[in-house]
Amino acid sequence: FKVATPYSLYVCPEGQNVTLTCRLLGPVDKGHDVTFYKTWYRSSRGEVQTCSERRPIRNLTFQDLHLHHGGHQAANTSHDLAQRHGLESASDHHGNFSITMRNLTLLDSGLYCCLVVEIRHHHSEHRVHGAMELQVQTGKDAPSNCVVYPSSSQDSENITAA
């Protein structure tokens, strides 16, 4: 399987909410011996390998934000810890995997990575990740709502954040 990032760039005004999204593509084994570990973290541009560095999102580590479930299940973080930081990650039955960040500030700007690990017995792993950039803007040049730029082209879509 692969991870697709529908949007490679999110440009949002300060104070807005945004949902960053990844999607699992290709055949996903939903057998009873398979578990999926999914998480989000920040990383840095200019690395040899994108997303190899794992930095916290709003002081929450990849383990604070992770989802862990079988192939047939949906999951979401209901941790008080994440919600206190204005964060929630979620995963549905259709391979969509997201993190919602509330009340954006300029400090939230940066590169974000989603990572999915397919785990089989006994402890074998297959890791895939996706990357996207978040730009939080302030002042007269900031958009009124988040603008997202699809990964496949430079056409932008105006979306109203939830």
Epitope: D33, Y37, Q49, Q63, H121, H122, H123, R127
Partner: antibody
Framework: QVTLKESGPALVKPTQTLTLTCTVT?????????WHWIRQPPGKALEWIGD???????NYNPSLKTRLTISRDTSKNQFVLTMTNMDPVDTATYYC?????????????WGQGTTVTVSS | DIVLTQSPATLSLSPGERATLSCRAS??????????MNWYQQKPGQAPRLLIY???NLESGIPARFSGSGSGRDFTLTISSLEPEDFATYYC?????????FGGGTKLEIK
């Protein structure tokens, strides 16, 4: 809150079979990764015995493999260690534990341990 | 099997001092940029407690005076300023290869 608790005999005679049960509360053994048995002889280091996956498949330490069976009872949310042909060198505190993943595999929850003495 | 050698076997220090515990593996425990090395604390009559996973990640609820570092074959657990409750035995454990193995332990005692 996830808790594990071992139960079984405190004393076993040489050549007998040991059966220990780990009862898990607060988490389904079919929903997690792997459920393990680990032991520690008095004053010595820890030794991994084996585990059972959420699917029911098992993995054993090669040094003990011929004597081991790990099984489970999903209706009771328990998993069971059976060790045959016990010897005094098997005297140890036996722990059950759950593993978890975070770019490493580690034991995040342990039982309190049960002491087993092998003696005639 | 991967053999983990911990040193020193016993470390005698006073509260407030810095403790440095070492663990050396007989072969690399790295995979895809991560180190499959964990550290546990054990007190007499108690089960081990996870401190550090993946060589450097602090388990939730563990005080920040504990830190882990290293990669490949050599790993270190550091306690920046010892508290009275830190005197215990510490074990490293690898999970890169079956069978999972533990080190022989380092006993941290009050000087």
């Amino acid at each position: 809150q996830v808790t594990l608790k071992e139960s079984g005999p405190a004393l076993v005679k040489p050549t007998q079979t040991l059966t220990l049960t780990c009862t898990v509360t607060g988490y389904s053994i079919t929903g997690g990764y792997n459920w393990h048995w680990i032991r520690q002889p008095p004053g010595k280091a820890l030794e991994w015995i084996g585990d059972i996956h959420k699917s029911g498949s098992t993995n054993y330490n090669p040094s003990l493999k011929t004597r081991l069976t790990i099984s489970r009872d999903t209706s009771k949310n328990q998993f069971v260690l059976t060790m045959t042909n016990m010897d005094p060198v098997d005297t140890a505190t036996y722990y059950c534990a759950r593993d978890y993943y975070g770019f490493s595999w580690y034991f995040d929850v342990w039982g309190q341990g049960t002491t087993v003495t092998v003696s005639s | 099997d991967i053999v983990l050698t911990q040193s020193p076997a016993t470390l005698s220090l006073s509260p407030g001092e810095r403790a440095t515990l070492s663990c050396r593996a007989s072969q690399s425990v790295d995979y895809d940029g991560d180190s499959y090395m964990n550290w546990y604390q054990q007190k007499p009559g108690q089960a081990p407690r996870l401190l550090i996973y993946g060589a450097s990640n602090l388990e939730s609820g563990i005080p920040a005076r504990f830190s882990g570092s290293g990669s490949g074959r050599d790993f270190t657990l550091t306690i920046s300023s010892l508290e009275p409750e830190d005197f215990a035995t510490y074990y490293c454990q690898q999970s890169i290869e079956d069978p999972w193995t533990f080190g022989g332990g380092t006993k941290l005692e009050i000087k």
